[in-house]
Amino acid sequence: HTAAQDNCTCPTNKMTVCSPDGPGGRCQCRALGSGMAVDCSTLTSKCLLLKARMSAPKNARTLVRPSEHALVDNDGLYDPDCDPEGRFKARQCNQTSVCWCVNSVGVRRTDKGDLSLRCDELVRTHHILIDLRHRPTAGAFNHSDLDAELRRLFRERYRLHPKFVAAVHYEQPTIQIELRQNTSQKAAGDVDIGDAAYYFERDIKGESLFQGRGGLDLRVRGEPLQVERTLIYYLDEIPPKFSMKRLTA
């Protein structure tokens, strides 16, 4: 896998251990926690990143109305089970044999159950709404400039194809970025919108996953764009299945 050959590091994932033990002495990097080989020329899957995070020392830690089926990650961190490709397994369980089904971004989409719970397939999250609030500025940002800057960022930093950034909405101080990617649209080699959104979320929190790159310095025509709040909504190709008790809570 491609990595910086001179000093054998993984530019796209600092939560790796790298050594020149690949074919022909090439640099090969493995994710912490899982030990899985990662491709350092692209983003690492969210599942492997969460697993690595859980294995690390604990101190390492026009606006759209989201649909009624939109999920927010309220459960926080957990140590996920990943498949051989690094994707989330459809069923996740904890050490006390409590199980639940997740979507392709690892967010719970059913009530919690026991080991008898069945999750037939990994349901794809095809629409992600990133809701940001920026710190006060002298005036509003120019919408077109802000829109272009965020689209450029997702192309350049996260390698997300421009066709997957569906829209950027802005009503000062709220910015919404819509990412859309159906199963049929995603070609081999395309970055997954869930992975791009996760890297962006960590960048915004000042917890960049990139190795040897500065933190995210977002500017619109030279004016700093500082985010003070982030909310991410996930929409699945099949609506989630929660009991009425949760829905009325």
Epitope: S144, H161, P162, K163, V165, A167, V191, R213, R221
Partner: antibody, heavy 117, light 106 residues
């Protein structure tokens, strides 16, 4: 096969406007970005701006803001770049180039714009 | 704006020579891109993401570097390599190019 075919050479008087076209084929037009770059005779490359073909989002380099207009006609898969208030320093070859997860992966053949009185 | 300065501006070399062109950025960039341009032709993408060869580019070309200092190397010059080379960044708007390095036959 990805192709970007640009319009022919133009001779314009100072103060006039020029509109250069870039017809795309071989890919889904609205999935990409078209950037515009110019090159004065014997000089280097200078970025003018870009247009996201799916959304119509545009970003112009500060130097050209107010003088340049980028548009696209999705029905004919053609992008346009219009530069107004032309002066002799605008004499250059103007290139369109496709953008994806790369800034420019395919380029048009270039359009020579000559500004002369 | 991020300024890119290429060195040298021009270079005379012979077929078979090893050639190195450097590109220095005024502030840190994530990746560098390199283009080859021949007279009367459009630029052609040569190297992306600092060190990855674009499709169809011979293995005698290589790229390296990080932060503010980047290098394009041609290990053994071939007659078709005599051209002008440009580095380019897109870590921030506006995208900028180096002033170019003209590679001529000695």
């Amino acid at each position: 096969e990805v192709q970007l075919v640009q319009s022919g050479p133009e001779v314009k008087k100072p103060g006039a406007s020029v509109k250069v076209s870039c017809k795309a084929s071989g890919f889904t037009f609205t999935d990409y970005v078209i950037g515009w770059v110019r090159q004065a005779p014997g000089q280097g490359l200078e970025w003018i701006g870009e247009i996201y073909l799916g959304s119509g989002t545009i970003y112009y380099a500060e130097k050209f803001k107010g003088r340049v207009t980028m548009t696209a006609d999705t029905s004919t898969s053609t992008a346009y770049m219009e530069l107004s208030s032309l002066r002799s320093e605008d004499t250059a070859v103007y290139y369109c180039a496709r953008g994806s997860i790369f800034p420019f992966d395919y380029w048009g053949q270039g359009t020579l714009v000559t500004v002369s009185s | 704006d991020i300024q890119l300065t290429q060195s040298p501006s021009s270079l005379s070399a012979s077929v078979g020579d090893r050639v190195t062109i450097t590109c220095s950025a005024s502030s840190s960039v994530s990746y560098m891109y390199w283009y080859q341009q021949k007279p009367g032709k459009a630029p052609k993408l040569l190297i992306y993401d600092t060190s990855t060869l674009a499709s169809g580019v011979p293995s005698r070309f290589s790229g390296s570097g990080s932060g503010t200092d980047f290098t394009l190397t041609i290990s053994s010059l071939q007659p078709e390599d005599f051209a002008t080379y440009y580095c380019q960044q897109w870590s921030s708007y506006p995208y900028t190019f180096g002033q170019g390095t003209k590679l001529e036959i000695k």
